[in-house]
Interface confidence: low
């Protein structure tokens, strides 16, 4: 009887020999095998010579086979896709002679320490190369010269300290480049050449911002909409650009794209561009203008964007340099913890965590003139903060409207830290309709750079903070008042703060409630008029750091009872990446915390 299962659902005969405790290739494979799955066996070594008679073989899967050596001593003329991922390969043989038709090569999650210069020679058809999660410390010059058709290159999660300057030369078809989570300090001048790369991942490296970074800085500014923060399980096309995810390891994690480069030479001889200092900073936000004729209300969509730390080997956690000494900050938040998850000590300091807030707000034409909500005392240049106060929860398996009040100001060219006091729990991201009252004033929605420093002056705001009482109820526990701080405004756009009471109901008593308090103070500015004009949609994306201090916890999951009738849609709430999963054990991919 045949060891493997056989099917022919396509024009190729597919043979599945996965997890059969094989130590060698089965002797009775069909001669016309086109797709061969050998994953999860104990092959140890593998030779392509064993497959030369399978002249239709197009896809070969050798993942998780405990491979320590691969011999390419047999030519597989038709093989297009080779999966060698999750093995123990420390080196790769020359592949081109044996696999001339190869279009996809996956050698991720191995132990490759280096690559020989000609390892890819002859792979003229290669379109996708996956080398992530290896031990690569450097790459040989000319490595990719033979692979002129390459479209996707993944070098993430290695130990690359530098890149050969001509690595991408001739790769005109390249559209996706993963370089996140390496030890890169800079990018060689001219590295990207004239390539147009729609999707580039560069975060979690040790970018060193000095005069040598200016080429890279300029490239980031020119390609701000093509730089992304990698998020596990999410297709790159479904994520939002985040150029601010590329940060200076030596400058308190300020974004590289906004590095001032003061005192650096600007002659074209030193760079691949003419004069860096003449280039204005690129905004950290992007604006999409959509025309509408029938929208009657403000609609605000919130979501936290981040890659959650998890036990996955490729969870994208921002790696901070060991020399980084961030300013201590505190935040208040409520966190949902699942049963069996690590219990936290009463007080704990985490590494700085980067948060990205995406605010998608549709402005509706209105003649209303909004009065200023506060003034800025001794303003820092070019810093116009935004106040956001929200109470949100997302209990598992429920769709719960939540009252929310929001005041936003977005002056031209402003740098907007987003201080927020919020209550939010969400074990699983879901779409939750939430009541809201929102006031948004926008002068130039298209320009909102992220601050390079988090230094803010804190004036006496005219908007008064008022206490909010929240009653927490659980089926099996006593009622416990939970103090929170909120800045609320009335639905009529007045700036008068009002006290609010929200009832918190807990369907499951299996979670942990944690308070964190932020010291970043809100500052509001500017009287703005929203004239009668075409509605526009503005997407603001902020990326900033905070350090968390955990306070005593309560076991509970919270649910807010709706009190208003307009709705805030919460399509996605995911956890933000932190330095390591160990440093913030309460941050898990299934959990969510709000800002800041």
């Amino acid at each position: 009887q045949h060891t493997c299962s056989i099917s022919k659902v396509t024009s190729l005969l597919e043979v599945n020999c996965e997890n059969k405790k094989l130590t060698a290739l089965p002797a009775d494979l069909p001669a016309d095998t086109g797709i061969l799955h050998l994953g999860e066996n104990q092959l140890g070594t593998f030779s392509t010579a064993s497959l030369v008679h399978f002249t239709h073989l197009t896809y070969l899967y050798l993942d998780r086979c405990e491979l320590t050596s691969l011999q390419t001593n047999g030519k597989l003329i038709k093989l297009e896709n080779l999966d060698l991922s999750h093995n123990n390969l420390k080196s790769l043989p020359s592949l081109g002679w044996a696999l001339p038709a190869l279009t996809t090569l996956d050698v991720s999650f191995n132990k490759l320490g280096s690559l020989s210069p000609g390892v890819l020679d002859g792979l003229s058809q290669l379109q996708e190369l996956y080398l992530q999660n290896n031990d690569l410390k450097s790459l040989p010059p000319g490595l990719l010269l033979p692979t002129t058709k390459l479209k996707k290159l993944n070098l993430a999660n290695n130990k690359l300290r530098e890149l050969p300057s001509g690595l991408l030369d001739g790769l005109e078809d390249l559209d996706t480049l993963y370089l996140q989570r390496n030890w890169l300090r800079t990018i060689p001048k001219g590295f990207f050449g004239t390539l147009l790369l729609p999707f580039v991942f560069l975060h979690a490296n040790s970018w060193y911002c000095d005069c040598e970074i200016l080429y890279f800085r300029h490239w980031l500014q020119e390609n701000a909409n093509n730089v992304y923060l990698w998020k596990q399980g999410v297709d790159v096309k479904d994520t939002t650009p985040n150029v601010a995810s590329v940060r200076c390891a030596n400058l308190d994690n300020a974004p590289v794209y906004s590095y001032p480069g003061k005192g650096c030479p600007t002659s074209s001889g030193d760079t691949d561009y003419d004069d860096y200092d003449d280039i204005p900073d690129v905004p950290a936000t992007r604006t999409e203008v959509k025309f509408s004729t029938n929208t009657k209300v403000h609609t605000t969509h919130w979501s936290l964007l981040a890659a959650a730390p998890s036990t996955s080997q490729d969870s994208q956690m921002i790696s901070l340099p060991p020399t980084h000494k961030p300013t201590k900050k505190q935040s208040t938040f409520i966190h949902t913890q699942s049963p069996g998850f690590t219990t936290l000590p009463e007080t704990m300091e985490s590494n700085p965590t980067f948060y990205s807030l995406k605010l998608n707000t549709v402005l509706i034409p209105s003649p209303t003139t909004l009065e200023p909500t506060s003034t800025q005392a001794t303003p820092e240049p070019n810093i116009q903060p935004m106040l956001t106060t929200s109470t949100l929860t997302t209990p598992e398996h429920s769709t719960t409207p939540v009252p929310t009040t929001t005041i936003l100001t977005t002056p031209e060219h402003s740098t907007i830290p987003v201080p927020t006091t919020a209550i939010l729990t969400t074990p699983k991201p879901s779409t939750i309709p939430v009541p809201t009252t929102a006031t948004l004033t926008t002068l130039e929605p298209s320009t909102t750079p992220v601050p390079t420093t988090a230094t803010l002056t804190t004036p006496e705001p005219s908007t008064t903070l008022v206490p909010t009482t929240a009653t927490l109820t659980t089926p099996e526990h006593s009622t416990t008042p939970v103090p929170t701080t909120a800045t609320l405004t009335t639905p009529e756009h007045s700036t008068t703060p009002v006290p609010t009471t929200a009832t918190l109901t807990t369907p499951e008593p299996s979670t942990t409630l944690t308070n964190l308090v932020s010291t970043i103070s809100p500052v509001l500015t500017t009287t703005l008029t929203t004239p009668e004009s075409t509605p526009i949609e503005t997407i603001l994306e902020q990326f900033f750091t905070t350090e968390l201090t955990l306070l005593p916890t309560l076991e509970s999951t919270t649910t807010i009872i709706p009190e208003q009738n307009s709705f805030l849609n919460l399509p996605e709430v995911a956890l933000v990446s932190s330095d390591t999963s160990e440093s913030s054990p309460f941050l898990n991919s299934d959990f969510c915390c709000f800002l800041p």
Epitope: T55, T72, I77, P93, S94, W97, A98, A101, T103
Partner: antibody, heavy 118, light 113 residues
Framework: QVQLVESGGGVVQPGRSLRLSCAAS????????MSWVRQAPGKGLEWVAS???????YYPDSVLGRFTISRDNSKNTLYLQMNSLRAEDTAVYYC????????????WGQGTLVTVSS | DIQMTQSPSSLSASVGDRVTITCKSS????????????LAWYQQKPGKAPKLLIY???TRESGVPSRFSGSGSGTDFTLTISSLQPEDFATYYC?????????FGQGTKVEIK
């Protein structure tokens, strides 16, 4: 220009061994895959062995385990070690350069005759 | 192994004639991904080494006169000499370089009529 010169052929008894050499010049030897192709008297061509630029050997079943192809890039020389020779191994042995990872042969030597006879 | 069969095994022709040699493979030599047929043609004169004429069915090796052309796809291939010249009298071999072991046809001898 590209030149391939074979040597080492001769008459040998069945079961004995012989080593052929091929001296290459006029191109960057280390960058090319090389092969041996033979032609029995009055017969057609038969591929015998190939070796990649990285040194990986490859054989047809007819010689597998008896013949060994190797190369010395420092000497620009290709070798074919032939053991357990049989009468049917009698042929002119050509050294040939393989083009660009595709196994067709763009340059050939003049050949060396190996006669296996008792 | 892929068997290669040439026809005719020999032919007589005169200078200026159009000569056609066919080669059949026991299985397709077409790589559907790149649409290339992995077939080469060689010319061999008595006492000499073979000389590459054509590879990938129709790509002429540099220095080969344009009167030599190749065509075909899948399992049926043709070498055409549009106007036979005195130096073209030789034996011609086809070779598949699609799947190992690389195999040759038995040869077609082109003689003077």
């Amino acid at each position: 220009q590209v030149q391939l010169v074979e040597s080492g052929g001769g008459v040998v008894q069945p079961g004995r061994s012989l080593r052929l050499s091929c001296a290459a010049s006029g191109f960057t030897f280390s960058s090319f895959a090389m092969s041996w192709v033979r032609q029995a008297p009055g017969k057609g061509l038969e591929w015998v062995a190939s070796i990649t630029s990285a040194g990986t050997p490859y054989y047809p079943d007819s010689v597998l385990g008896r013949f060994t192809i190797s190369r010395d890039n420092s000497k620009n020389t290709l070798y074919l070690q032939m053991n357990s020779l049989r009468a049917e191994d009698t042929a002119v042995y050509y050294c040939a350069r393989s083009r660009g990872y595709e196994d067709y042969f763009d340059y050939w030597g003049q050949g060396t005759l190996v006669t296996v006879s008792s | 192994d892929i068997q290669m069969t040439q026809s005719p095994s020999s032919l007589s022709a005169s200078v200026g004639d159009r000569v056609t040699i066919t080669c059949k493979s026991s299985q397709s030599l077409l790589n559907s991904r790149n649409q290339k047929n992995y077939l080469a043609w060689y010319q061999q004169k008595p006492g000499k080494a073979p000389k590459l004429l054509i590879y990938f069915t129709s790509t002429r090796e540099s220095g080969v006169p344009s009167r030599f052309s190749g065509s075909g796809s899948g399992t049926d291939f043709t070498l055409t000499i549009s106007s036979l010249q005195p130096e073209d009298f030789a034996t011609y071999y086809c070779q598949q370089h699609y799947s190992s072991p690389w195999t040759f046809g038995q040869g077609t001898k082109v003689e003077i009529k």
